[in-house]
């Protein structure tokens, strides 16, 4: 068998670090057998069999000019093998960050913090951190480690499915190359990394007969679980065209009636979502939707949701008090089940 341990990576390649002493090993001989070393395609003897180094070639302070293919020959001139030298660096700890778009799963991405120049792979795992006792942290068998399954096609991402919202996790991402391994440990709490996707289906409609009103509606992001135990709250911003500043409101449900729109001007509207109890951070803003308040008079048929507003708005009426906001039924999803085992009925 070969005296040369096979490093992780392509066969026939051996590895070293620039500026360091590098030993090349002749693969086709017995350990200690004296060999001669040549650069491939060059007749000059690099190291003879009388060097006392047996089957190894020593390159002091290797640099890029030493990279390439080497040939070793036994005393009788037989080919002992060919070796390709590739120089690079041991792994540095990768940079890791994790994010969650819902409260049941999270993903972690990583980047090398230094390019090694060598074949590299990543080992990804996680364990659930369980604290037992006042100030001792002990592991129970159920806490892992478990593999964090990596995305196919080499994307630097792994996903933990079925995570527990209240638990802490320790992510392990280890960068491995032929010169070693280096590990980054990252402690993750789903509560702190939760950032929902932005709300979807944002629509902005005029309210017939009300030249200062716009009705915006939207839906939960598709990535949020269909029957959520944890709910979302929303933030809505709007502004007239060409106006630099946004006005912000926090709607009670999945729609909002804007009562101070500028008559006749198109308005941009966008919404953002966050966990109902303020875990994590606000989502990015949804794509803007546009709407223009109606200019006509109030219709004879008043929409059911607008029955409170029986007086048409007359512009300009600077001093007139704004009519009461429409009373929106709470959406069933806006009931917080986080601390409740029972289902709460919404009475219409």
């Amino acid at each position: 068998s070969s005296p040369c341990p096979q490093a992780w990576g392509p066969p026939g390649v051996q590895y070293g670090q620039p500026g360091r002493s590098v030993k090349l090993c002749c693969p086709g001989v017995t350990a200690g057998d004296p060999v001669s070393w040549f650069r491939d395609g060059e007749p000059k003897l690099l190291q003879g069999p009388d060097s006392g180094l047996g089957h190894e070639l020593v390159l002091a302070q290797a640099d890029s000019t030493d990279e390439g293919t080497y040939i070793c020959q036994t005393l009788d001139g037989a080919l002992g093998g060919t070796v390709t030298l590739q120089l690079g660096y041991p792994p540095a700890r990768p940079v890791v960050s994790c994010q969650a778009a819902d409260y049941e799963n999270f993903s972690c991405t990583w980047s090398p913090s230094q390019i090694s120049g060598l074949p590299t792979r990543y080992l990804t795992s996680y364990r659930k951190k369980t604290v037992l006792g006042a100030d001792s942290q002990r592991r129970s068998p159920s806490t892992g480690p478990w593999p964090c399954p990596q995305d196919p096609l080499g994307a630097a991402r792994c996903v933990v499915h079925g995570a527990e919202f209240w638990s802490q996790y320790r992510i392990n991402v280890t960068e491995v190359n032929p010169l070693g391994a280096s590990t980054r440990l990252l402690d993750v709490s789903l509560q702190s990394i939760l950032r929902p996707d932005p709300p979807q289906g944002l629509r902005v409609e005029s309210v017939p007969g009300y030249p200062r009103r716009l009705r915006a509606s939207w839906t939960y992001p598709a990535s949020w679980p269909c029957q959520p135990h944890f709910l979302l709250k929303f933030r809505l911003q709007y502004r007239p065209a060409q106006h630099p500043a946004w006005s912000t409101v926090e709607p009670a449900g999945l729609e909002e009636v804007i009562t101070d729109a500028v008559a006749g001007l198109p308005h941009a509207v966008r919404v953002s979502a966050r966990d109902f109890l303020d875990a994590g951070t606000w989502s990015t803003w949804s794509p803007e939707a546009w709407g223009t308040p109606s200019t006509g008079t109030i219709p004879k048929e008043i929409p059911a949701w607008g029955q409170l507003h029986t007086q048409p708005e007359v512009e300009p009426q600077v001093d007139s008090p704004a009519p009461p906001r429409p009373s929106l039924q709470p959406h069933p999803r806006l009931l917080d089940h986080r601390d409740s085992v029972e289902q709460v009925a919404v009475l219409a």
Epitope: A92, V95, S97, T109, S111, S113, Q114, I115
Partner: antibody, heavy 118, light 107 residues
Framework: EVQLLESGGGLVQPGGSLRLSCAAS????????MTWVRQAPGKGLEWVSS????????QYADSVKGRFTISRDNSKNTLYLQMNSLRAEDTAVYYC???????????WGRGTLVTVSS | DIQMTQSPSSLSASVGDRVTITCQAS??????VEWYQQKPGKAPKLLIY???NLQTGVPSRFSGSGSGTDFTFTISSLQPEDIATYYC?????????FGPGTKVDIK
């Protein structure tokens, strides 16, 4: 010669913006994480921001988050720091520094002075 | 953020003296600590990495030790050119932090 050279510092009013650059030479810039560290006059060192070789991960000190943006152009061997909404407390010498790895700084530039004052 | 405390804040010693600076982290940082030397008007220079490894080209009179939360930096025989401020720094997590520095001068 292995070196880092910062530029772009100067006097700016509070609320203003400035863009710092750091030109790298003598090493394979695209292989290393890069960092900005600052030092207020007569004070200690404060880490500001770092970026991985690919640019895919960045990190900021809480004191600059949302106001500063770190970026790099590997084709130009240059690191940048875009500084917006500047405050008097951002007055400092800004150094750019090279990895190895993340958070380890084995090569520093000479620094560029940023003064925020009205 | 991890806080790094350094002591003393300043010291005076004679040429040839052994000088010791300590650094304490507010939480375990494994061995991910570096020591820097900064001379007036100059950029910092890396002396020690990974708590105890001497950076290439740095004189062997400089050394470091420690792990977890407690770290020590030593100049075995102080030289006139060692007048400077010395900083410890942790890089265990993604937000590195520096100690406040120790100013070293000659008696």
């Amino acid at each position: 010669e292995v070196q880092l050279l910062e530029s772009g510092g100067g006097l700016v009013q509070p609320g203003g913006s400035l863009r710092l650059s750091c030109a790298a030479s003598g090493f394979t810039f695209s292989w290393y994480s890069m960092t900005w560290v600052r030092q207020a006059p007569g004070k200690g060192l404060e880490w500001v921001s770092s970026i991985v070789p690919s640019g895919g991960h960045t990190q900021y000190a809480d004191s600059v988050k949302g106001r500063f943006t770190i970026s790099r152009d590997n084709s130009k061997n240059t690191l940048y720091l875009q500084m917006n909404s500047l405050r008097a407390e951002d007055t400092a010498v800004y150094y750019c520094a090279k990895g190895p790895g993340w958070g380890s700084f084995d090569l520093w530039g000479r620094g560029t002075l940023v003064t925020v004052s009205s | 953020d991890i806080q790094m405390t350094q002591s003393p804040s300043s010291l005076s010693a004679s040429v040839g003296d052994r000088v010791t600076i300590t650094c304490q982290a507010s939480q375990d940082v494994s061995g991910y600590v570096e020591w820097y030397q900064q001379k007036p008007g100059k950029a910092p220079k890396l002396l020690i990495y990974d708590a105890s490894n001497l950076q290439t080209g740095v004189p062997s009179r400089f050394s470091g030790s420690g792990s977890g939360t407690d770290f020590t930096f030593t100049i075995s025989s102080l030289q006139p050119e060692d007048i400077a401020t010395y900083y410890c720094q942790q890089y265990d997590n993604l937000s590195p932090t520096f100690g406040p520095g120790t100013k070293v001068d000659i008696k």
